[in-house]
């Protein structure tokens, strides 16, 4: 058993049918010695008397808020949560497996630049009685500081019969060094509590691997005289690291007809302009990627040819 | 060339070669199914590689103040990786395919290190750790780890040379 926060304790339960459970001793936080009784949640049933209460925690029915009283007065509370292990595996019931980029991906994180700021998000089908707390550090044995805000509900989606809720959190490395080569990964730890169930989720990554630039901005077309060709120009997104001579992007320019089946013409360039043939009803899209490290491409920025 | 006394390297040549190194490092080890090599344990194998750290002066301001600290660090790393790519980790079983980019990568690391340091001037180099994995699968895993680490290293080096070519070239 360990303390999650003041008066909230997590009991680690290795569960299997007929498991003996975990013996837990609760102590009433009071100088009083006599006349103390214990109850669980809203029930008035007395579970025991004395300054300590010994319970055998076998299932969620044994978890909840234990209260010690004396003569009708509440002395202290202890909330017991369960962290359940089955077949040697800690439960992961609260969050959905996003399966991208691989199975058992519960947390996904992205950064728009090398400033040490990143966003993580996760999905759940649970709508109530749910709390999250997020901690992060650079490295684990001698951790360096990363400050995370509060997790907030960022989107709701309907998936078939189900509603899906997306939560996200923003974190910032305290002493980020954008130009350095990372040698220790960022660790992100999310504590999730639903009703009386505690679970924890972790992710470990280098900022360089989660970079996804914003789409290029100010995408413009300039027709070339007496030609079907156009000059496409764009700019680095505002959120990208500076100076651009150091933090350089590469770009992919795509001409796409109305029909998805039409052949796409693609050009790759390090410049912020390109000359392409603009077909009727086609659109021109540009996306960006770090020039020197193959992390994610940005989303497309698009303009119609006409 | 970065010669004793600290004159400037051939920034543009270094830029071109370092960008080529980036391309080669990724073609040698593309992100196959997002294999997370940090989960594979045996951290000490790639913990000893030289990293371009915060105090190494490889940021834009540090390069403007005195690029020599950074260039020395990059040179150390190039020599270190060049030795690794020439060691039995890469020459032993399982054999690399004949058209593997590792050979070109090895040659380009050497080429860039020579651009940075002419004959007769020696910066101290980092000792290469004695890594001799006994099993072919261990060797394969080590290759992946080294290449992933090299990708990060050459990305920073390429940024340095691109910025130098744009802002520090005579």
């Amino acid at each position: 058993i360990w303390e999650l926060k003041k008066d909230v304790y997590v009991v680690e339960l290795d569960w299997y049918p007929d498991a003996p459970g975990e013996m837990v001793v609760l102590t009433c936080d009071t100088p009083e010695e006599d006349g103390i009784t214990w109850t669980l949640d809203q029930s008035s049933e007395v579970l025991g008397s004395g300054k300590t209460l010994t319970i055998q925690v076998k299932e969620f029915g044994d978890a909840g808020q234990y209260t010690c009283h004396k003569g009708g007065e509440v002395l202290s509370h202890s909330l017991l949560l369960l962290h359940k292990k089955e077949d040697g595996i800690w439960s992961t019931d609260i969050l959905k497996d996003q399966k991208e980029p691989k199975n058992k991906t519960f947390l996904r994180c992205e950064a728009k630049n090398y400033s040490g700021r990143f966003t993580c998000w996760w999905l759940t089908t649970i709508s109530t009685d749910l709390t999250f707390s997020v901690k992060s550090s650079r490295g684990s044995s001698d951790p360096q500081g990363v400050t995370c805000g509060a997790a907030t509900l960022s989107a709701e989606r309907v998936r078939g019969d189900n509603k899906e809720y997306e939560y996200s959190v923003e974190c910032q490395e305290d002493s980020a060094c954008p130009a350095a080569e990372e040698s220790l990964p960022i660790e992100v730890m999310v504590d999730a509590v639903h009703k009386l169930k505690y679970e924890n989720y972790t992710s470990s990554f280098f900022i360089r691997d989660i970079i996804k630039p914003d789409p290029p901005k100010n995408l413009q077309l300039k027709p070339l005289k007496n030609s079907r060709q156009v000059e496409v120009s764009w700019e680095y997104p505002d959120t990208w690291s500076t100076p651009h001579s150091y933090f350089s992007l590469t770009f992919c320019v795509q001409v796409q007809g109305k029909s998805k089946r039409e052949k796409k013409d693609r050009v790759f360039t390090d410049k912020t302009s390109a000359t392409v043939i603009c077909r009727k009803n086609a659109s021109i899209s540009v996306r960006a990627q770090d020039r020197y490290y193959s992390s994610s491409w940005s989303e497309w920025a698009s303009v119609p040819c006409s | 060339r970065a010669v004793p006394g600290g004159s400037s390297p051939a920034w543009t040549q270094c830029q071109q070669l370092s960008q080529k190194l980036c391309t080669l490092a990724w073609s040698a080890h593309p992100l196959v199914g997002h294999m997370d090599l940090r989960e594979e344990g045996d951290e000490e194998t790639t913990n000893d590689v030289p990293h371009i750290q915060c105090g190494d002066g490889c940021d834009p301001q540090g390069l403007r103040d005195n690029s020599q600290f950074c260039l020395q660090r990059i040179h150390q790393g190039l020599i270190f990786y060049e030795k690794l790519l020439g060691s039995d980790i890469f020459t032993g079983e399982p054999s690399l395919l004949p058209d593997s980019p590792v050979g070109q990568l090895h040659a380009s690391l050497l080429g860039l290190s020579q651009l940075l340091q002419p004959e007769g001037h020696h910066w101290e180099t980092q000792q290469i750790p004695s890594l001799s994995p006994s099993q072919p699968w261990q060797r394969l895993l080590l290759r992946f780890k080294i290449l992933r680490s090299l990708q990060a290293f050459v990305a920073v080096a390429a940024r340095v040379f691109a910025h130098g070519a744009a802002t520090l070239s005579p």
């Epitope: 569960w15 299932e59 969620f60 029915g61 089908t125 009703k195 | -």
Partner: nanobody, 123 residues
């Protein structure tokens, strides 16, 4: 959000068997841990059995262990209670419940309830 409808109750002789079904509709069935409870007139609701969302783990009250089997079919959105060697003291209204906590024998840990199906065991 989840509607539960029990069926399969009836009158049987002691020692006989019965299979109860509980059909779920609404939200995704496989998100929920499922349970069976029973309530005889004038008594508290009593836990019978529960099953986790994947159907890989089950949990039983001591009074039914070895006689009752809970199972589920996530493709049919249905949970079952196979009752054998029935006794007169098994007579009750059997209620199906859906919740988020497994294992739990406590009724307030379940969020959704069916109306129940009557099982009467005569001697």
């Amino acid at each position: 959000e989840v509607q539960l409808v029990e069926s399969g109750g009836g009158v049987v002789q002691a020692g006989e068997s019965l299979r109860l079904s509980c059909a779920a509709s609404g939200r995704s069935f496989s998100d929920y841990e499922m349970g069976w409870f029973r309530q005889a007139p004038g008594t508290e609701r009593e836990f019978v059995a529960s099953i986790n969302r994947r159907g890989s783990s089950t949990f039983y009250a001591d009074s039914v262990k070895g006689r009752f089997t809970i199972s589920r079919d996530n493709t049919k959105n249905t949970v079952y209670l196979q009752m054998s060697s029935l006794k007169p003291e098994d007579t009750a209204v059997y209620l199906c419940a859906a919740g988020w906590l497994f294992p739990s024998s406590r009724s307030r840990d379940y969020d959704y309830w069916g109306q129940g199906t009557q099982v009467t065991v005569s001697s």
